[in-house]
Every structure is written in structure tokens, then in C-alpha cells.
């Protein structure tokens, strides 16, 4: 099956408070993610991935503690983040006069969580407070999901996508990438 290579038992711990955890700074709008020489990953970051091919929607893992105010999980948890590009660029440059705008060469896809599961984590609190149990949501796998031009910019920001460049005469399309960035593009698997 097309996704088997990316599936594994590691999970992402997501605070119950409703928001996603902040991805590491390297994952946010970092141009090095699109560079072949870095293996599709930020350098010097303790990520591991089951699939080392570049430009894949893949599950990256790192370790952190779950916190709630002064309380902290007894053990660090392995967190999963969906990262990477879903295929080759599907936005092409169009030069009109001196300006440049972007037009699509195919639908756009975004690497996002696919399936979730829930787990309880025990939190230890200072000052002799009783341990707390916290229910957290875990990402079980990732997928390349269709993105339309009707998705708003705040949604894009949630997933750390690059800011869209407006297209002439229509709403901005997501994930426009420069022709130069495209040159570094290698193979992808879905």
C-alpha cells in the first residue's frame, strides 16, 4: 500500500487544552527543509524518520515532556509531527510585464495528520500535589490531503506552510515556491 513505508507505532502527544504543540522552530517556514543537501530535514536536530527519501510526507519524531502549568509528565513522550512536501511543485511562475504571479499546474496537497488515538499521561506536580492524569490526543499517521484555494491563511499557518503568493485575479493559492527552490526538488513518494 502506498503509505505503508511511513506508518509506525510512534505517536504524537497533543495537549488536551485544544491547541497543537508548537513544532520545533526549524519546522516553521525554514527554507532548509526544501534543500537536497540537508536530506529534507533541518540539520542538527534530533529527528528520526523511517523514510529517508527527500520530499516525502513523513512522520518525524522527537522527545518532549507534556506540561500543564507547573506540572510535568513523569517521562518524556515521543511526539510525531507530519512534515515534508507532497510531491513536486504544482505552481508555475508566469511573468507578465515586470511582475510575477503564480498559476497552478495541478492540485495542491498538504502533509497533515491522518489518524489519531487517545492516551492518558500522568503528570507530576511540585509541592506535594497529587499526580494528575491528562488525556492527550496522538497522531497515528500522516497523509497528503488536498488543499484548495478556499483554505484560509490561518489554516496554512497552523501547519507551518510557506506564505502564499497572491495570484493575479484570484485568491491566493497555498505553497507557492520559487523556480529556484524547485531546482533542489528531488523525488517524492506518497
Amino acid at each position: 500500500q502506498g503509505w505503508q513505508a511511513f506508518k509506525n507505532d510512534a505517536t504524537e502527544i497533543i495537549p488536551e487544552l485544544g491547541e497543537y504543540p508548537e513544532p520545533p522552530p526549524e519546522l516553521e517556514n525554514n527554507k532548509t527543509m526544501n534543500r537536497a543537501e540537508n536530506g529534507g530535514r533541518p540539520p542538527h536536530h534530533p529527528f528520526e524518520t523511517k523514510d529517508v527519501s527527500e520530499y516525502s510526507c513523513r512522520e518525524l519524531h522527537f522527545t518532549r515532556y507534556v506540561t500543564d502549568g507547573p506540572c510535568r509528565s513523569a517521562k518524556p513522550v515521543t511526539e510525531l509531527v507530519c512534515s515534508g512536501q507532497c510531491g513536486p511543485a504544482r505552481l508555475l511562475p508566469n511573468a507578465i510585464g515586470r511582475g510575477k504571479w503564480w498559476r497552478p499546474s495541478g492540485p495542491d496537497f498538504r502533509c497533515i495528520p491522518d489518524r489519531y488515538r487517545a492516551q492518558r499521561v500522568q503528570l507530576l506536580c511540585p509541592g506535594g500535589e497529587a499526580p494528575r492524569a491528562r488525556k492527550v490526543r496522538l497522531v497515528a499517521s500522516c497523509k497528503c490531503k488536498r488543499l484548495t484555494r478556499f483554505h484560509n491563511q490561518s489554516e496554512l499557518k497552523d501547519f507551518g506552510t510557506e506564505a502564499a503568493r497572491p495570484q493575479k485575479g484570484r485568491k491566493p493559492r497555498p505553497r507557492a515556491r520559487s523556480a529556484k527552490a524547485n531546482q533542489a526538488e528531488l523525488e517524492n513518494a506518497y
Epitope: 502506498g2 520530499y55 510526507c57 507532497c86 510531491g87 513536486p88 511543485a89 504544482r90 508555475l92 498559476r103 497552478p104 499546474s105 495541478g106 492540485p107 496537497f109 497523509k143 497528503c144 490531503k145 488536498r146 484548495t148 484555494r149 478556499f150 484570484r170 523556480a179 524547485n182 531546482q183 526538488e185 528531488l186 523525488e187 517524492n188 506518497y190
Partner: antibody, heavy 123, light 107 residues
């Protein structure tokens, strides 16, 4: 008229490689990613992957990853699909296809297809 | 991958009959569902995209409906040239996947 014309039928032995070509005409070749879809005898359709003719960047169905390479030659408006380590179950008709777009619904579909290239893998 | 299940896999009908083919996705694919017609020895031809949008030049006897996971292709009055195999295809999640096909044969 938009057309995709593919190379002729091939007979290959197991373990060999095949390279199928797809020549585009009637539109600007670099305006659309090129896709490849295959169909085994009496079976359904299976999407293999796509390539951006501008950048040469390709995306493959994981099922074929490591065995398939898609390339383009913009000077001749031709796309190529090479499949390696052929097995008998790779016997199929291979199609190149180009997407069409509806701006109102922001939707895409396989609009233009090549005539297909029959690849037979047999010892 | 998203599995696309078509039913029936084959059917026999007469000219003038109303024919309905269903396609079920293993997960929600919104309206990103296309229908193709294929005749023996030929490449598939697009009939309907975005669930219900008829491609220009396709006869109005073809129609599509549904959303989410369940979709339908209807031929209101079957014509001799409609005997073929029909495939659905989802465009919501990579890799793109197709249904197994429904062969419409002459009764």
C-alpha cells in the same frame, strides 16, 4: 488539439527495464505536470506518479518507489517513465495523462490521455 | 491509501434503461470524485468531475451525485455507445486511486 502520443509496445524479460515515452502537443508542455497511470489486463487503473516538467521534480506512488523514474525533455515536449526490475505482474498498458482544471470549483481531473503503451513482461 | 469500491462490478442492461453505478470511498473525499468511461483497447475518457460536473461535450443523460464517501453515476437512458466500463477516481488524497470498474453489458 491537445494530444499525447506514446511509444510503441514493448516485450521485456523479468528483471529488465522499460522506458516509455509520451510526446505532448497542442499546449505548452511546461504548463502542466505529467502523470502516469497503468492498467493490468482485465484490471482497474493504478496511478503511478507525476512529474513537474519545469523543475524535474517527481512524486511517485509508494508502491513503485525505488523502481520507477519519471523524466521530461522540455526541448521535445516529451515525458518518460522508466520502470526497472520488471516482474510478470508489471504486464500492463501504461498511460501518460494530463490534468484539466475547473477554476470555478478549483478542481482537477485526468482530461487528456495518451493512447497507451502495452508492456509485456515474459520469460 | 483510500480504497474506492464500485458496485456492481458488472451489469446487463438494455438500450433505454436507467443505469445506476455506485462508488464508495474508504474515507471522506469531499466532492473530489471523477467518473471515466473506457472502451476495450482505448484510453479512459472523462465524463464527470467534482462529483456532478459534466465535462463539455458529454451527453446530459450522464449525471453524478453524492458527497463524502458515497457517490453515484446515473445514465438516464442507456444508448448503444454507452456499453463500456466505468471507473470512479478520488482526487482528495495522494496517491490518487480508482475504483475497480463497472462493466455495462448488453442484455
Amino acid at each position: 488539439e491537445v494530444q499525447l502520443v506514446q511509444s510503441g509496445a514493448e516485450v521485456k524479460k523479468p528483471g529488465a527495464s522499460v522506458k516509455v515515452s509520451c510526446k505532448a502537443s497542442g499546449y505548452t508542455f511546461t504548463d502542466y505536470n505529467m502523470h502516469w497511470v497503468r492498467q493490468a489486463p482485465g484490471q482497474g487503473l493504478e496511478w503511478m506518479g507525476e512529474i513537474n516538467p519545469n523543475s524535474g521534480g517527481a512524486g511517485y506512488n509508494q508502491k513503485f518507489k525505488g523502481r520507477v523514474t519519471m523524466t521530461t525533455d522540455t526541448s521535445t515536449s516529451t515525458a518518460y517513465m522508466e520502470l526497472r526490475s520488471l516482474r510478470s505482474d508489471d504486464t500492463a498498458v501504461y498511460y501518460c495523462a494530463r490534468l484539466g482544471y475547473d477554476d470555478i470549483y478549483d478542481d482537477w481531473y485526468f482530461h487528456v490521455w495518451g493512447q497507451g503503451t502495452t508492456v509485456t513482461v515474459s520469460s | 491509501d483510500i480504497q474506492m469500491t464500485q458496485s456492481p462490478s458488472s451489469l446487463s442492461a438494455s438500450v433505454g434503461d436507467r443505469v445506476t453505478i455506485t462508488c464508495r470511498a474508504s474515507q471522506d473525499i469531499s466532492n473530489y470524485l471523477n467518473w471515466y468511461q473506457q472502451k476495450p483497447g482505448k484510453a479512459p475518457k472523462l465524463l464527470i468531475y467534482h462529483t456532478s460536473r459534466l465535462l463539455s461535450g458529454v451527453p446530459s443523460r450522464f449525471s453524478g451525485s453524492g458527497s463524502g464517501t458515497d457517490f453515484t453515476l446515473t445514465i438516464s437512458s442507456l444508448q448503444p455507445e454507452d456499453f463500456a466500463t466505468y471507473y470512479c477516481q478520488q482526487g482528495d488524497t495522494l496517491p490518487y486511486t480508482f475504483g475497480g470498474g463497472t462493466k455495462v453489458e448488453i442484455k
